[in-house]
Interface confidence: low
């Protein structure tokens, strides 16, 4: 059968029918339904929601909907032994204690099972000592402290403000600096936008609000006890001492009211420059320790959380493809939340629910996609992307042979200013073409396309007249699909104006105040931005599953490969003498990129001309497109990060959220001037250039004519 026969109606009509079926009112209703109680991973409430979603997806018309369960390591506070931080005097008396939980938002005072703020996977401990303020606890912040200011964090408790980088990287940096505890806090400079009221009167963080979150350094491993393999009934589990990525020092998060009490007494060195100052009325002294009158006082942490192997549940729905059922397009987002999940994740889950409903409606009318669509409601994302990673580990052989694309669907909004897209270069043209067909929801852009408003508000730094599309990093459920398995991936959401709002994420992220009312009152009362995100995510899935030729353009990969090669070369050229001394050449990489560009161009010409009515040739060309992303996977992985296997992209070693290009070379060059053995260090740079050049060349050859 041809695609059109199999799918009953013409592709254009299909897409329009699918998009027209998506309704803002339904997304609103689903969001309300998903946010009335907490859905913490591993709890009964989240299991019940999984069963509800399973039941509703079946009603919507999917062919099958199954629960996939795993027993993974999670972390919870001790219910009768709360975590807190105190200031103690010379007699050991506690003269100040931090809050034990956030004041509940209006209307939620009687809700049970609100987990108090904690840093998931913190070890237990009661360290006491002097405080050192370490700014954002980034690599460069510790360089400033240790190298420029000669401040030693060894044996100290450090206090770091949230923002800029993933919290797990902050903790790792603090550990490496010798700290014995970490206090994380939200500074108003990063989580309180000027001119906006705090919740419940606006979308800003109140002083008692606290960001929860895991502090793991998993590097893509999934469940810390079963790296590489699913945490199933017969799993062999590592001992806790061998678990992947667990922090070794106690960590706890606080709000800015409590932070004020700790920071106002700080003495020692003044902040090195204005970039170390937040917005609290405190000196932002670095320490160590408290000033004059308070110099005998210390800080003590009281952390009693426990790590427990707990059952989690993914919901996996299938809509079988009519023509290529063995080709999978996956739409996945998580279901578990820290508390109510008003934005993270339920604004995304509600959109997925409506996309499933729309696809189901078309199916009931006799339509099927060309390729199989898998829908996933992942569990335990907040605890380290565990649900998605375990499922991908269990199904890795199927996915690496059959996976066409993965579209992520966490939070649909982090603002209401413009679209934000991160994806593989293979999807650039798909995203451009789709957004040109969608209406912009933005004020002042009535009757204009989404592409137009997006390009105006978020222009590409390289190409005029085009919107910015960012690299994929991590911190979300696409990680295993893209970074480990090499499946083309993308994500889209509505975001804030990064120019005017320099706070990190959105202010109420992972707090108790992330409620339905936050979204309905302040972010998207008409749910028009949610609808637009549903159209983008759903439209991408539709095209990927239904277009006869896969909507991937390999020429866009060629363009970025050249850009990334130029960038890494310019970083290396900061050390011209060493490059000369150690004979470091990038010729092989530039040659490989040139070959890739030429071969991709020829492939694209053949793609225009081949006989699409020949199913064998069609499948062959589509397979070359599908497997191109796979060709960038190095089975040996990156140094010390075996589950990050993509040679072109990896999460930054200094910030899990950010993507780094040619990460192997980048990490080899990083801080190379401080390495004790320069010959060995530059040898590793040369090896990484070799790996990158080989991989690009090998990927290019997958696009050559097959015989």
């Amino acid at each position: 059968k041809s695609s059109n026969e199999a799918t009953n109606i013409t592709p254009k009509h299909n897409m329009k029918a699918f998009l027209d079926e998506l309704k803002a009112e339904n997304i609103k209703k689903f969001l309300y339904n998903f946010t009335q109680i907490p859905h913490l991973a591993g709890t009964e409430q989240n299991f019940q929601l999984a069963k509800q979603i399973q039941s509703q997806w079946k009603e919507f018309g999917l062919d099958s909907v199954e629960l996939a369960h795993y027993d993974v390591l999670l972390s919870y506070p001790n219910k009768t032994h709360p975590n807190y931080i105190s200031i103690i005097n010379e007699d050991g008396n506690e003269i100040f204690n931090t809050s034990l939980f956030e004041p509940p938002p209006p209307g939620y005072e009687n809700v049970s099972d609100i987990v108090p703020p904690f840093s998931a996977f913190s070890p237990q401990g009661m360290p006491e000592g002097d405080l050192v303020y370490v700014n954002y606890a980034r690599t460069e912040d510790f360089f400033k402290l240790e190298r420029d200011m000669k401040i030693n964090c060894s044996g100290k408790i450090v206090i770091a403000r949230y923002g800029k980088v993933f919290r797990g990287n902050k903790v790792k940096n603090a550990q490496l600096a010798g700290a014995k505890g970490v206090i994380l806090y939200s500074d108003p400079a990063d989580y309180f936008a000027p001119g906006v009221k705090s919740y419940p009167d606006g979308w800003n963080l109140p002083g008692g609000g606290v960001q929860r979150g895991n502090i793991l350094n998993l590097n893509g491993a999934g469940d810390p006890l079963t790296p590489g393999y699913p945490a199933n009934e017969y799993a062999y589990r590592r001992g806790i001492a061998e678990a992947v990525g667990l922090p070794s020092i106690p960590v706890h998060p606080i709000g800015y009211y409590d932070a004020q009490k700790l920071l106002e007494k700080m003495g020692g060195s003044a902040p090195p420059d204005s970039s170390w100052r937040g917005s609290l009325k405190v000196p932002y002294n670095v320490g160590p320790g408290f000033t004059g009158n308070f110099s005998t006082q210390k800080v003590k942490m009281h952390i009693h959380s426990t790590n427990e192997v707990t059952r989690i549940y993914n919901v996996i729905g299938t809509l079988r493809g009519a023509v290529e059922p063995d080709r999978y397009v996956i739409l996945g987002g998580h279901r578990d939340s820290w508390v109510f999940g008003g934005i993270d994740p339920q604004s995304g889950a509600a959109v997925v629910h409506e996309i499933v409903r729309s696809f189901g409606t078309l199916k009931k009318e006799g339509w099927r996609p060309r390729r199989t669509i898998l829908f996933a409601s992942w569990d335990a994302e907040e605890f380290g992307l565990l649900g998605s990673t375990e499922w991908a580990e269990e199904n890795s052989r199927l996915l690496q042979e059959r996976g066409v694309a993965y579209i992520n669907a966490d939070s649909s909004i982090e603002g209401n200013y413009t679209l934000r897209v991160d994806c593989t270069p293979l999807m650039y043209s798909l995203v451009h073409n789709l957004t040109k067909e969608l209406k912009s929801p933005d004020e002042g852009f009535e009757g204009k396309s989404l592409y137009e408003s997006w390009t105006k508000k978020s222009p590409s730094p390289e190409f005029s007249g085009m919107p910015r599309i960012s690299k994929l990093g991590s911190g979300n459920d696409f990680e295993v699909f893209f970074q480990r398995l090499g499946i083309a991936s993308g994500r889209a959401r509505y975001t804030k104006n990064w120019e005017t709002n320099k706070f990190s994420g959105y202010p109420l992220y992972h707090s108790v105040y992330e409620t339905y009312e936050l979204v309905e009152k302040f972010y998207d009362p008409m749910f028009k931005y949610h609808l637009t995100v549903a159209q983008v995510r759903g439209g991408m899935v539709f095209e990927l599953a239904n277009s006869i030729v896969l909507p991937f353009d390999c020429r866009d990969y060629a363009v970025v490969l050249r850009k990334y090669a130029d960038k890494i070369y310019s970083i290396s050229m900061k050390h011209p003498q060493e490059m000369k001394t150690y004979s470091v050449s990038f010729d092989s990489l530039f040659s490989a990129v040139k070959n890739f560009t030429e071969i991709a161009s020829k492939f694209s010409e053949r793609l225009q001309d081949f006989d699409k009515s020949n199913p064998i040739v069609l499948r062959m060309m589509n397979d070359q497109l599908m497997f191109l992303e796979r060709a960038f996977i190095d089975p040996l992985g990156l140094p010390d990060r075996p589950f990050y296997r993509h040679v072109i992209y990896a999460p930054s070693s200094h910030n899990k959220y950010a993507g780094e290009s040619f990460p192997g070379i980048y990490d080899a060059l990083f801080d190379i001037e401080s390495k004790v053995d320069p010959s060995k260090a530059w040898g590793e740079v040369k090896r990484q250039i070799y790996v990158a050049a080989f991989t690009v060349q090998a990927a290019a050859e997958t696009l050559s004519e097959v015989a």
């Epitope: 032994h81 709360p82 807190y84 105190s86 050991g92 008396n93 506690e94 003269i95 100040f96 204690n97 931090t98 809050s99 034990l100 939980f101 956030e102 004041p103 108090p116 008692g208 009211y257 009281h302």
Partner: nanobody, 116 residues
Amino acid sequence: EVQLVESGGGVVQPGRSLRLSCAASGFTFNNYGMHWVRQAPGKGLEWVAIISYDGNSKYYTDSVKGRFTISRDNSKNTLYLQMNSLRVEDTAVYYCAKGLWPSDVWGQGTTVTVSS
């Protein structure tokens, strides 16, 4: 000298209410979290409720949730425990304690007997 003095205990029937008070002196009351602990006859200490220094955060053991309310009046240096729907098993000596677990200063206790 740091002192905590509990009051308000007594004998009540099941289902009735009592309000315990704890007067604090000798330290800066509004800098400290406080808690109530109880000891039933012949049993060990059982933690009952905690309140943060500013009164914003409250924590209860499962057996008293929804029945007991911890509160404080920082202007009066006083901690309270409102006990509603009392049960026979709530019979104990109730102590208030300064700081959070494990506490450094305890009161002398006030006895609550719930009996029909």
